[in-house]
């Protein structure tokens, strides 16, 4: 946030940027949560616009019986892996074809007994407050998934009349690893000394980290005519004052009539 | 990457034999191999599989009159076909498993390479 100065006074406001600001010839450039002529007000609303998609990913281990173990498949650029790691893709597309948050898998590492394949399954879902209970119903249809393929799907007579066949005892769930994202968190550490005073409100699923100074959310503080400004100690509002009226109290709705001071008289609405 | 190219079809009458052969551009030594054909307005379907090992597998459509066989040094396979009928007509194809798949027969899903066929049309 930048506000531009003109004229002589800017040499003056050159070495009164507050707040970490810096000048920069022409006006003070302000960190993220300053704005104002000399990085003076505190922001209202900080960004901490959510990730369009979160990601689980499922470390799991599957035996394929119908492919004979070979050194090859450890070589990544050989033909054997590449032929095998097209196969196994398209058979874990099938499994996994009914569920939405399935993206794709990846091959980590092929071992000897028949042909013990490592891999992660890779999940991702928009996000939305619920982006967690999504995921977690995601990862146990697919072990659901998993089980009941390499159950079904086994050598009968030394046939394998499947795309792939599996050794029933060799699937296993290792981890699951789902990115963190945290509104509150990020809302509290992006307002650092001013943690305490932003919140968290949604608007059509969407955070937003919000002080009560931001309008038209449920902790707004209304300073009718005056400002809210925040600071170290919390909102505050800065009461102004008209031709006619001075305004006081915490949220400025005292209003005294000039004339009536002048006068000696005092008059609230 | 495999190359497959079939020859040996062509118009027969009901009754008589036919060879097909394919040809594969690279080692087929430790793939399964298969043929398939798809007749006019059905779905693909399995003919007759055989194992790097020898280990044969058919259609029971073809069962006694069909026989796939195949030679490594030449990497090619063969299927040879006798007492021919009109429900045979189709396009034939030849199609090769990843390395060293076991266990096979001639289910379709077990190939990732598939040639462009040849036809086979039996008819008086």
């Known amino acids: 946030r930048t506000t531009t100065c003109f004229g002589d006074g800017c040499q003056n406001t050159a070495s009164r940027c507050k707040n970490g600001g810096t000048w920069d010839g022409l006006k003070c450039q302000c960190p993220n949560l300053y704005y104002g002529e000399l990085c003076e007000e505190v922001v209202s609303s900080i960004d901490i616009g959510p990730p369009e998609t979160i990601s689980a990913q499922m470390e799991l281990t599957v035996t394929v019986t119908s492919v004979k173990f070979t050194e090859e498949l450890k070589n990544h650029s050989s033909q054997e892996f590449q032929e095998f790691k097209q196969t196994f893709t398209e058979q874990m597309n099938i499994v996994y074809s009914g569920i939405p948050e399935y993206v794709g898998v990846n091959i980590t590492k092929l071992r000897l007994g028949s042909v013990v394949v490592e891999h992660d399954v890779l999940l991702r879902t928009k996000y939305t407050p619920e982006y967690k209970t999504v995921l977690d119903n995601a990862t146990e249809v697919v072990k659901e998934k998993i089980t009941k393929v390499t159950t079904q799907q086994i050598m009968i007579n030394d046939i394998c009349s499947d795309m792939m066949c599996f050794n029933t005892t060799g699937t296993q769930v290792q981890n699951i690893t789902v990115t963190q994202y945290d509104p509150e968190e990020d809302c509290r550490k992006m307002a650092k000394e001013y943690g305490d005073y932003f919140v968290v409100e949604y608007r059509d699923q969407k955070p937003y980290c919000i002080s009560p100074c931001e309008p038209g959310f449920s902790v707004s503080k209304n300073c009718n005519l005056g400002k809210c400004q925040m600071s170290l100690s919390g909102p505050q509002c800065l009461c102004v004052t008209t031709e006619t009226h001075w305004y006081s109290g915490e949220t400025c709705n005292q209003g005294t009539q000039k004339s009536l001071v002048y006068g000696h008289h005092h008059h609230h609405h | 990457e495999v190359q497959l190219v079939e020859s040996g079809g062509g118009l027969v009458q009901p009754g008589r034999s036919l060879r097909l052969s394919c040809a594969a551009s690279g080692d087929i030594t430790r793939r399964c191999m298969g043929w398939f054909r798809q007749a006019p307005g059905k779905e693909r379907e399995g003919v007759a599989g055989i194992s790097e090992d020898g280990i044969t597998g058919y259609a029971d459509s073809v069962k006694g009159r069909f026989t796939i066989s195949r030679d490594n040094a030449k990497n090619s396979l063969y299927l040879q076909m006798n007492s021919l009928r009109a429900e045979d007509t189709a396009l034939y194809s030849c199609?090769?498993?990843?390395?060293?798949?076991?266990?096979?027969?001639?289910?379709?899903?077990?190939?990732?390479?598939r040639g462009q066929g040849t036809m086979v049309t039996v008819s008086s």
């Open positions: 199609a090769a498993s990843i390395l060293n798949r076991v266990g096979c027969r001639q289910l379709s899903y077990e190939y990732i390479y």
